[in-house]
């Protein structure tokens, strides 16, 4: 058993049929010695008397809010949550495995630039009685500060018969140095509680590996005289790190016909313009990637050829 926060405790249980559970001793936070009784979840049933209560915690029915009273007055509370361990592995019932980029990926994170600001998100099919807390640091042995906001419900989707809920959180490294080579990874820790079940999830990454630029902006076409060719031009996204001479992007320009089966023409360039042939009913798309480090490509910015 360990204290999650004041008056909230997590009991770690090996979870298998007929498991013995954990013996837990609760102490009433009071100078009183006599006439103390204990109840669980405001039930009228008295579980025991005295300053301490010893319980055997085996299942969720044994978790909850234990209250000690004297003469009808509440003296203190202890909330017990359960953290299940099955076959030596902590349970991951609350969050959904996103399976990208690999199995057992529960948290996914992205950064639009090198400022030290990043967003993480996770998925669940649980709609209610669910809470999260997010902490982060750079490194774990001598951690440097990262400040995270509150996790919020950011999207709801219907997946077959199930509803899926996406939660997200924004974090900012307190003393970020965008141009510095990272040697220690960012650690993100998410505590999750559903009713009386506690779970925790972690992710570890370098900002450089989670970079995904915003799409190029101001994508424009300029027809070239007496030619089927057009000059495509665009700009760096506003959210990308500056100066662009140091934080450089490379671009992929694609001409795509109306039909997905049509052959795509692709051009790669470090410039912010390119000359391509604009076919009828086609569209031109441009996406960006860090020029010197192969992290994710941005989403496409697109304009129709006509």
């Amino acid at each position: 058993i360990w204290e999650l926060k004041k008056d909230v405790y997590v009991v770690e249980l090996d979870w298998y049929p007929d498991a013995p559970g954990e013996m837990v001793v609760l102490t009433c936070d009071t100078p009183e010695e006599d006439g103390i009784t204990w109840t669980l979840d405001q039930s009228s049933e008295v579980l025991g008397s005295g300053k301490t209560l010893t319980i055997q915690v085996k299942e969720f029915g044994d978790a909850g809010q234990y209250t000690c009273h004297k003469g009808g007055e509440v003296l203190s509370h202890s909330l017990l949550l359960l953290h299940k361990k099955e076959d030596g592995i902590w349970s991951t019932d609350i969050l959904k495995d996103q399976k990208e980029p690999k199995n057992k990926t529960f948290l996914r994170c992205e950064a639009k630039n090198y400022s030290g600001r990043f967003t993480c998100w996770w998925l669940t099919t649980i709609s209610t009685d669910l809470t999260f807390s997010v902490k982060s640091s750079r490194g774990s042995s001598d951690p440097q500060g990262v400040t995270c906001g509150a996790a919020t419900l950011s999207a709801e989707r219907v997946r077959g018969d199930n509803k899926e809920y996406e939660y997200s959180v924004e974090c900012q490294e307190d003393s970020a140095c965008p141009a510095a080579e990272e040697s220690l990874p960012i650690e993100v820790m998410v505590d999750a509680v559903h009713k009386l079940k506690y779970e925790n999830y972690t992710s570890s990454f370098f900002i450089r590996d989670i970079i995904k630029p915003d799409p190029p902006k101001n994508l424009q076409l300029k027809p070239l005289k007496n030619s089927r060719q057009v000059e495509v031009s665009w700009e760096y996204p506003d959210t990308w790190s500056t100066p662009h001479s140091y934080f450089s992007l490379t671009f992929c320009v694609q001409v795509q016909g109306k039909s997905k089966r049509e052959k795509k023409d692709r051009v790669f360039t470090d410039k912010t313009s390119a000359t391509v042939i604009c076919r009828k009913n086609a569209s031109i798309s441009v996406r960006a990637q860090d020029r010197y480090y192969s992290s994710s490509w941005s989403e496409w910015a697109s304009v129709p050829c006509s």
């Epitope: 999650l4 926060k5 909230v8 979840d41 405001q42 039930s43 978790a63 909850g64 809010q65 909330l79 209610t128 809470t131 999260f132 807390s133 509150a150 505590d191 509680v193 009713k195 009386l196």
Partner: nanobody, 119 residues
Amino acid sequence: EVQLVESGGGLVQPGGSLRLSCAASGFTFSTHWMYWVRQAPGKGLEWVATSTFNILTGTENTYYSDSVKGRFTISRDNAKNTLYLQMNGLKPEDTALYYCARDSSGNLKGQGTQVTVSS
């Protein structure tokens, strides 16, 4: 066994106020989202407000239906296992049986308390 007992309803004039209470027992109140729902005469159940409490951060969030936003305030006292609904600027269309519930569809609810808004 889950018990939800509502109180505080009554007859009030338009523009008046009432405060409803719901005493909860038989479950861990602080880890549950709690709801007020209502049923007007001859109508179905309508969601009114939600209170979520984050035991990890100690923060409460509240959500309201458009019909009561700005007039009603949901709150909770986890130490007393009690949910409240402060209703101001009451209108005749707020007349209904008000239930405290443990889910938004009202499957797990109390016996209700009647609110009548009439001059």
